[in-house]
C-alpha cells in the first residue's frame, strides 16, 4: 500500500499556503483528485510529488494515490482543506443526473471542517427542501439525498454558518430520471371482436409509461391509422388512449388490428382481430364422442363449447328418454366463459344409475336461432345369470338367462361335488356356447341371452355352472340336482336380484 | 329422523361367508339409497357398493365375485352377504344412507372379525 | 377407482388454532368431496358436502373448499371436541376415500 505524507488524514491550510504531497509506493504510484488549478506534478520512479505554493478553495478535497501495478489494488487518501473565509464551499459539478432510487451525491466540499456543526441543505432562493427528503452530509463528500424521486429534480445550494450569517454555494441542479423498465405497457380492447354488418364497434388501445416520451399508434391490417390522441397522468404514470370508433362496420373493417407502442427501451405490440359477419351465427360442437358408454356406478361429463354471436339468450340440457321423465338438475350444470364468444357448458352425472342411461341433450338460443347437441349414454353392466331346469320338446334342458351390457359370454361347467363355484380340480365338461340366443337388446338396456344345455340325465352327485362375462365384469349360477328335484342357486346361496 | 343398526355375527371363520343385516327405523326404505362402507382396524373407510331403491345394485369391483347387497322393503331391513372371507375382511361394516353424493346417516357399525 | 390423498397424517394444534387438512383426487372429481369426522370408538358423521357445503347442525368454524383435483377443509378455530379423524370422500365416481387426517389436540 503507497504511503502519504505528511501523515495525516486532514490538513487544513489557508489560502495562498504552500502544499506538499508526496506519495511512495513500491513501484511507480498515480495521484487521483479534484480538477482543481495550479498543481505541479513530480515523478521519481516509485515516489510522487504533488504540489501548490498558491493554494485556494478549490484545491480543496481528497486525494488519493494509488499503485497500478498492485494486485491487491492499495492506494491512500489524504482530505486537503483550504479555509477561504470567503468561501465556506467548493463545488466539484453544478449538474448530477441519477436514476430514481438511488443516492445523488451533490459535491459541495466544505472548505473549513470547523464550519460542519452549521451546514444545510436548501433550495436556490431560499426555498425549504420537499417533504420526505432524506438527506446526509459528509464534510469531505458533500450532501447525499438517499433514495432520490423524481420529483426532488430541483437547483439545490449549501449553505454554511459563518459568523451568525449564511453563506450559500453555487448552485447544483440534480436530474433525477426515471427508470424505465421497458417498453410501455399496453391494452387493446377487446381482445376479440365480432360485430354483424352495420352495428357499431370500438376498439381502444392505450400504452402508460413512468416517463412521458414514448409513441403509440394503431394499425388495421399493416396500414397505420390516423386517430386524435388522448393524454393523461395518474398513478404516476402518463397514459395515451387511441379510440376508434366505427358506426357501421362493414366487411373491409374487419381483420388485424396491432395496437403499438415504443420508447428508448423498445418496442411493445399487442394484436386483436375483428370478424364482421353478415347474421348472428350459432355453433354447437364436443371433443368428446357424441356416442358415451360407461360402466354403472361411474361418473361422467358432458362437455359442449357454444360459439355465438350475439350472446346466448337461453341454454339447457334436457334428458329426451327412454327411461324416467327425470331431468338434470340445474346444480349439475356448469357454465364457463373461454372469452365473449366461446363457452362451455358442462353437465356432471355422478355414480350413474340405470335409470340415467339415454339422450342428453344441449340446446342453446341466440338471435340467429336456436341450435341442439345430444349425446348418447349407454351404461355398461356386469352380467346377472340365472338358471332353471325345464323340459324342452320332451328333453330335459338346464336354461341360462345373462343379462348385462356389452352382450354377454357364456360358458357352462359340469363339476364333481356340490359347489357353489367350480373350481378347476372339479371340473369334469366345458361347453362354450359362442351363440347364445338374444331374448332382448333394446337401446340403452341390457342385452339378455338364453343358453341352453340339453342334459339326458342330471348327476346328483354333481354341479351344474352357468358363467357368463363381458368387458365390465363375470356373474355365475350354480344348479345342483338333488333327488327330490332340482335345486338352483348363485354362488353362496345369494338370491338372484334382477 | 332416520336411524340406521347393523346386526352382524361377530366373528366369521376364514373362508365362510358373512350375513349382516341393516334394520332402518324413521322412514320407508323405498325412498332411499344404501351403501355399505367397511373400515378395518385402524384404517380408512372403503365402500363396498350400493343398493338403489328399485332393488338394483352397484358393487365396488373389487368385491363384484363375492358380494351381494339385497333389501326387504316391508321389513325395512338391507342384507350384506359376502363369501370367502379372509382375515384383510376383518372391519367394522357400517350401513349407511346414500343420497348419491354423499353419505349422510350413519348405522354404528357392526365389528366383524375373521379368525379360526 | 379414483385415489384421494390426504395430507398431514397427522397434526398436533392447540385449541384457538387454525387448521387446513388437505385432500387431492388423482383425477377430476367436480365438486363432489365430502368431508367426515370421526372420533374415536364412533361412526362417522357428514361435516361438508359437496366440496364447500356445511351440513346441517356442523358448526360454522368447519368450512370447505376446492374443486377438480384439490379440496381443503379449514377448522377456523380448533375446539378440544374437534379431536377426531378426518376423512375426505368423492361421490362422482365409485366412492373412494383418503387415508384421514388425525387431529390431536395439545
Known amino acids: 500500500i503507497p504511503v502519504i505524507e505528511p501523515s495525516v488524514p486532514e490538513l487544513v491550510v489557508k489560502p495562498g499556503a504552500t502544499v506538499t504531497l508526496r506519495c511512495v509506493g513500491n513501484g511507480s504510484v498515480e495521484w487521483d483528485g479534484p480538477p482543481s488549478p495550479h498543481w505541479t506534478l513530480y515523478s521519481d520512479g516509485s515516489s510522487s510529488i504533488l504540489s501548490t505554493n498558491n493554494a485556494t478553495f478549490q484545491n480543496t478535497g481528497t486525494y488519493r494515490c494509488t499503485e497500478p501495478g498492485d494486485p491487491l489494488g492499495g492506494s491512500a487518501a489524504i482530505h486537503l482543506y483550504v479555509k477561504d473565509p470567503a468561501r465556506p464551499w467548493n463545488v466539484l459539478a453544478q449538474e448530477v443526473v441519477v436514476f430514481e432510487d438511488q443516492d445523488a451525491l451533490l459535491p459541495c466540499l466544505l472548505t473549513d471542517p470547523v464550519l460542519e456543526a452549521g451546514v444545510s441543505l436548501v433550495r436556490v432562493r431560499g426555498r425549504p427542501l420537499m417533504r420526505h427528503t432524506n438527506y446526509s452530509f459528509s464534510p469531505w463528500h458533500g450532501f447525499t439525498i438517499h433514495r432520490a424521486k423524481f420529483i426532488q429534480s430541483q437547483d439545490y445550494q449549501c449553505s454554511a454558518l459563518m459568523g451568525g450569517r449564511k453563506v450559500m454555494s453555487i448552485s447544483i441542479r440534480l436530474k433525477v430520471q426515471k427508470v424505465i423498465p421497458g417498453p410501455p405497457a399496453l391494452t387493446l380492447v377487446p381482445a376479440e371482436l365480432v360485430r354483424i354488418r352495420g352495428e357499431a364497434a370500438q376498439i381502444v388501445c392505450s400504452a402508460s409509461s413512468v416517463d412521458v416520451n414514448f409513441d403509440v399508434f394503431l394499425q388495421h391490417n399493416n396500414t397505420k391509422l390516423a386517430i386524435p390522441q388522448q393524454s393523461d397522468f395518474h398513478n404516476n404514470r402518463y397514459q395515451k388512449v387511441l379510440t376508434l370508433n366505427l358506426d357501421q362496420v362493414d366487411f373491409q373493417h374487419a381483420g388485424n388490428y396491432s395496437c403499438v407502442a415504443s420508447n428508448v427501451q423498445g418496442k411493445h405490440s399487442t394484436s386483436m382481430f375483428f370478424r364482421v359477419v353478415e347474421s348472428a351465427y350459432l355453433n354447437l360442437s364436443s371433443e368428446q364422442n357424441l356416442i358415451q358408454e360407461v360402466t354403472v356406478g361411474e361418473g361422467l361429463n358432458l362437455k359442449v363449447m357454444v360459439e355465438a354471436y350475439p350472446g346466448l339468450q337461453g341454454f339447457n340440457w334436457t334428458y329426451l328418454g327412454p327411461f324416467s321423465d327425470h331431468q338434470p338438475e340445474p346444480k349439475l350444470a356448469n357454465a364457463t366463459t373461454k372469452d365473449t364468444y366461446r363457452h362451455t357448458f358442462t353437465l356432471s352425472l355422478p355414480r350413474l344409475k340405470p335409470s340415467e342411461a339415454g339422450r342428453y341433450s344441449f340446446l342453446a338460443r341466440n338471435p340467429g336461432g336456436w341450435r341442439a347437441l345430444t349425446f348418447e349414454l349407454t351404461l355398461r353392466y356386469p352380467p346377472e345369470v340365472s338358471v332353471i331346469w325345464t323340459f324342452i320338446n320332451g328333453s330335459g334342458t338346464l336354461l341360462c338367462a345373462a343379462s348385462g351390457y356389452p352382450q354377454p359370454n357364456v360358458t357352462w361347467l359340469q363339476c364333481s361335488g356340490h359347489t357353489d363355484r367350480c373350481d378347476e380340480a372339479q371340473v369334469l365338461q366345458v361347453w362354450d356356447d359362442p351363440y347364445p340366443e338374444v331374448l332382448s337388446q333394446e337401446p340403452f338396456h341390457k342385452v339378455t341371452v338364453q343358453s341352453l344345455l340339453t342334459v339326458e340325465t342330471l348327476e346328483h352327485n354333481q354341479t351344474y355352472e352357468c358363467r357368463a362375462h363381458n368387458s365390465v365384469g363375470s356373474g355365475s349360477w350354480a344348479f345342483i340336482p338333488i333327488s327330490a328335484g332340482a335345486h338352483t342357486h348363485p354362488p353362496d346361496e345369494f338370491l338372484f336380484t334382477p | 329422523q332416520v336411524q340406521l343398526k347393523e346386526s352382524g355375527p361377530g366373528l366369521v371363520a376364514p373362508s365362510k361367508s358373512l350375513s349382516i343385516t341393516c334394520t332402518v327405523s324413521?322412514?320407508?326404505?323405498?325412498?332411499?339409497?344404501i351403501s355399505w362402507i367397511r373400515q378395518p382396524p385402524g384404517k380408512g373407510l372403503e365402500w363396498l357398493g350400493v343398493?338403489?331403491?328399485?332393488?338394483?345394485?352397484n358393487y365396488n369391483s373389487g368385491f363384484m365375485s363375492r358380494l351381494r347387497i339385497s333389501k326387504d322393503n316391508s321389513k325395512s331391513q338391507v342384507f350384506l352377504k359376502m363369501s370367502s372371507l379372509q382375515s384383510d375382511d376383518t372391519a367394522i361394516y357400517y350401513c349407511?344412507?346414500?343420497?348419491?353424493?354423499?353419505?349422510?346417516?350413519w348405522g354404528a357399525g357392526t365389528t366383524v372379525t375373521v379368525s379360526s | 377407482n379414483i385415489v384421494m390423498t390426504q395430507s398431514p397424517k397427522s397434526m398436533s394444534m392447540s385449541v384457538g388454532e387454525r387448521v387446513t387438512l388437505s385432500c387431492k383426487a388423482s383425477?377430476?372429481?367436480?365438486?363432489?368431496v365430502s368431508w367426515y369426522q370421526q372420533k374415536p370408538e364412533q361412526s362417522p358423521k357428514l361435516l361438508i358436502y359437496?366440496?364447500?357445503n356445511r351440513y346441517t347442525g356442523v358448526p360454522d368454524r368447519f368450512t370447505g373448499s376446492g374443486s377438480a383435483t384439490d379440496f381443503t377443509l379449514t377448522i377456523s378455530s380448533i375446539q378440544a371436541e374437534d379431536l377426531a379423524d378426518y376423512y375426505c370422500?368423492?361421490?362422482?365416481?365409485?366412492?373412494?376415500f383418503g387415508t384421514g387426517t388425525k387431529l390431536e389436540i395439545k
Open positions: 349407511v344412507r346414500d343420497p348419491r353424493l354423499y353419505f349422510d346417516v
Open positions: 324413521g322412514s320407508s326404505l323405498d325412498s332411499f339409497d
Open positions: 343398493i338403489w331403491t328399485g332393488g338394483g345394485t
Open positions: 383425477e377430476d372429481v367436480v365438486t363432489y
Open positions: 359437496g366440496a364447500s
Open positions: 370422500g368423492q361421490t362422482f365416481s365409485y366412492p373412494t
